[in-house]
Amino acid sequence: MRRERGRQGDSSSCERQVDRVNLKPCEQHIMQRIMGEQEQYDSYDIRSTRSSDQQQRCCDELNEMENTQRCMCEALQQIMENQCDRLQDRQMVQQFKRELMNLPQQCNFRAPQRCDLDVSGGRC
């Protein structure tokens, strides 16, 4: 079906929606994917929850946003920002970003089209 896009709504409302949801399961899920069972990542008890459970919790949280598809970019940017300081080297940053980019599809959403995940001004 053809559609002509109008305005998408304001990003400040997305910020409010992102602030209201708990992104920790998403952060844990991605860290689990890139760290596996490595003991060095023990600030979350990631071994106590299977990765598939974390993924489901993450998807449920993203679904809590009123307009998940429109606000997906802000959610991904916030996850990146939250975890930036925990990523120990450039390779880990790239791994995290790759997993983060795959997250929408894992939750059966479309990946955001225009979305820059380099949000930390070069820190990450």
Epitope: M1, R2, R3, E4, R5, G6, R7, Q8, G9, D10, S11, S12, E15, C73, E74, Q77, M101, R110, A111, P112, Q113, R114, C115, D116, L117, D118, V119
Partner: antibody, heavy 123, light 110 residues
């Protein structure tokens, strides 16, 4: 070599209509977003409209929405801009551009530009 | 008035370095990728930088792009008289569902 050639510009009275065309060659037209950008005399660049590869999604500058229609014919490698209810402030050189936007985690960027066609709206 | 703010003009001597800033908000630069264009007098614009930092083939490495937060910067080193032109930044604005261009910056090589 990528080429974009605009045509259809000219002098038109306020309230009138014009249809701009852009003939594309040197690349697979059906795989790219396309965009119209305009530049009023002595002024800066202003984005006008985007159209997705298959024509299913279109975005417009607020001031032209409802008056201008962007369309494409992939079989003819052609992009169009139908301009109705023209106003003096629509006077500008209109550029046809290829947009490098991809399906995800990408940005709009205009990597090839036509030479432009001048639209003058005056009585 | 453009939502993306650029200085109207900058100038420097040949061989020197110059930077051109582009300031926006969270809904545009903060959210999306930035591109930069050079427009020589009487010609169509030309892409210099896309996706914040990438250079198309054929653009010399004297031109560089960066982004931090809601601002982007174009850097030009080893200035040449042929660099005298208008320079524009651009990005998508998620609130407006529109591409925004900066107002343009006229570069003069003294």
């Amino acid at each position: 070599e990528v080429q974009l050639v605009e045509s259809g510009g000219g002098l038109v009275q306020p309230g009138g209509s014009l249809r701009l065309s852009c003939a594309a060659s040197g690349f697979k037209f059906s795989t790219f977003y396309m965009t119209w950008v305009r530049q009023a005399p002595g002024k800066g660049l202003e984005w006008v409209a985007n159209i997705k590869q298959d024509g299913s999604e279109k975005d417009y500058l607020d001031s032209v929405r409802g008056r201008f229609t962007i369309s494409r014919d992939n079989a003819k490698n052609s992009l169009y801009l139908q301009m109705n209810s023209l106003r003096a402030e629509d006077t500008a050189v209109y550029y046809c551009t290829r947009n490098g936007l991809q399906d995800s985690y990408s940005g709009d960027f205009f990597d090839h530009w036509g030479q432009g066609t001048l639209v003058t709206v005056s009585s | 008035q453009s939502v993306l703010t650029q200085p109207p003009s900058v100038s420097a001597a040949p061989g020197q370095k110059v930077t051109i800033s582009c300031s926006g908000t969270g809904s545009n630069i903060g959210h999306n990728y930035v591109s930069w264009y050079q427009q020589l007098p009487g010609t169509a614009p030309k892409l210099l930088i896309y996706d914040n930092t990438k250079r198309p083939s054929g653009i010399p490495d004297r031109f560089s792009g960066s982004k931090s937060g809601t601002s982007a910067t174009l850097g030009i080193t080893g200035l040449q008289t042929g660099d005298e032109a208008d320079y524009y930044c651009a990005t998508w604005d998620a609130d407006l569902s529109a591409v925004l261009f900066g107002g343009g910056t006229k570069l003069t090589v003294l």
